[in-house]
């Protein structure tokens, strides 16, 4: 069964910077990745970035840079301009659309007591969508 993993990492050098790492474990080719925060895509979450293997990437503030790490994983850098970080309590979700599996989504967040540089363990909560 395909699975999506999500890791949220606070940058050790800059406490207002975070990186979300997401990956797809399974066969098939990725056709689109959508990253959202505050909840799943299409279910109350706010779209932060979309990545397409051919059409490129788009991101919306507070996202700063979305990029492919491998053919099946991505990273998204976020910059919190506020004095206190809302990211610490926020859920980030990654949805991978792949052929022929369909869409799989998983969410993760920064552990409440994490030290800078530590990341949340993978928290796959797959949501199968019949697209």
């Amino acid at each position: 069964t395909p699975e999506v993993w999500v890791q949220v990492q606070m940058e050790a050098t800059e406490l207002s910077s975070f990186t979300v790492h997401c990956g797809f474990l399974g066969p098939g080719s990725i056709s689109l990745v959508t990253v959202s925060w505050g909840g799943p895509d299409g279910a109350g979450g706010t779209k932060l970035a979309v990545l397409h293997p051919e059409l490129g990437t788009r991101q919306w503030a507070p996202a700063r840079q979305a990029r492919w790490e491998t053919q099946s994983s991505i990273s998204l850098a976020l910059e919190d301009s506020g004095a206190s970080s809302p990211f610490a309590n926020t859920t980030f979700c990654c949805k991978f659309a792949s052929f022929p599996e369909g869409s799989w989504e998983s969410c993760g967040s920064l552990p409440p007591s994490s030290d800078p540089g530590l990341s949340a363990p993978p928290t796959p909560v797959p949501i199968l969508r019949a697209d």
Epitope: G38, G44, G56, R58, W60, R64
Partner: antibody, heavy 119, light 106 residues
Framework: QVQLQQSGPELMKPGASLKISCKAS????????INWVKQRPGQGLEWIGW????????YYNEKFKGTATLTVDKSSSTAYMLLSSLTSEDSAAYFC????????????WGQGTTLTVSS | DIQMTQSPSSLSASLGGKVTITCKAS??????IAWYQHKPGKGPRLLIH???TLQSGIPSRFSGSGSGRDYFFSISNLESEDIATYYC????????FGGGTKLEIK
């Protein structure tokens, strides 16, 4: 086809408030950011802010924080911009525009709403 | 905030000719620039995004290029319907328009 239909022209008095509407059709309203843009007479375009209809999350140009408030009504696929404490500086054309994501920013625009603030 | 300096602010060209508009960003915008045509009484029209990607239905007379901080927009084989004001927009971080270029035909 994608369409954004804005409310009609308005003549308002200084100090008043105005809510401009932008009704979307032809696509899934909750999937795309809606932006608002200002154009003063004879001037260029200025980005006011955006709202993501799926969550109601907003992001404003610092210049317009406190004067513009963006909201949506998902049930009617309508975006709104409330302009408060109007002054003559608010006299302008206001446009809503959809963000097309990978198809480019502001790929569809409303026809504009002209606001005149005068005593 | 990223600033966009667009030049020239106005230009006049002959039918069938070619014009080029420049936008310079205050920092690298990673090719995240779009170009719009705006005619009075209408909403602007997206012509090009991501520096050089032509929007569906836009004639190939319109083109874009550039990288880093410097970007260019050209119209070749000018037609009378091209009379309009043209704007660049950076969308690498938030959104900033250039000041606009008013195109007139000689």
């Amino acid at each position: 086809q994608v369409q954004l239909q804005q409310s009609g022209p308005e003549l308002m008095k200084p100090g008043a408030s105005l809510k401009i509407s932008c009704k979307a059709s032809g696509y899934t309203f909750t999937d795309s950011y809606i932006n608002w843009v200002k154009q003063r007479p004879g001037q260029g375009l200025e980005w006011i802010g955006w709202i993501f209809p799926g969550s109601g999350s907003t992001y404003y140009n610092e210049k317009f924080k406190g004067t513009a408030t963006l909201t949506v009504d998902k049930s009617s696929s309508t975006a709104y911009m409330l302009l408060s404490s109007l002054t003559s500086e608010d006299s302008a054309a206001y446009f809503c525009a959809r963000d097309g994501g990978l198809r480019g920013p502001f790929d569809y625009w409303g026809q504009g709403t002209t606001l005149t603030v005068s005593s | 905030d990223i600033q966009m300096t667009q030049s020239p602010s106005s230009l006049s060209a002959s039918l069938g000719g070619k014009v080029t508009i420049t936008c310079k960003a205050s920092q690298d915008i990673n090719k995240y620039i779009a170009w719009y045509q705006h005619k009075p009484g209408k909403g602007p029209r997206l012509l090009i995004h991501y520096t050089s990607t032509l929007q569906s239905g836009i004639p190939s007379r319109f083109s874009g290029s550039g990288s880093g901080r410097d970007y260019f927009f050209s119209i070749s084989n000018l037609e009378s319907e091209d009379i309009a004001t043209y704007y660049c927009l950076q969308y690498d971080h938030l959104l900033t328009f250039g000041g606009g270029t008013k195109l007139e035909i000689k």
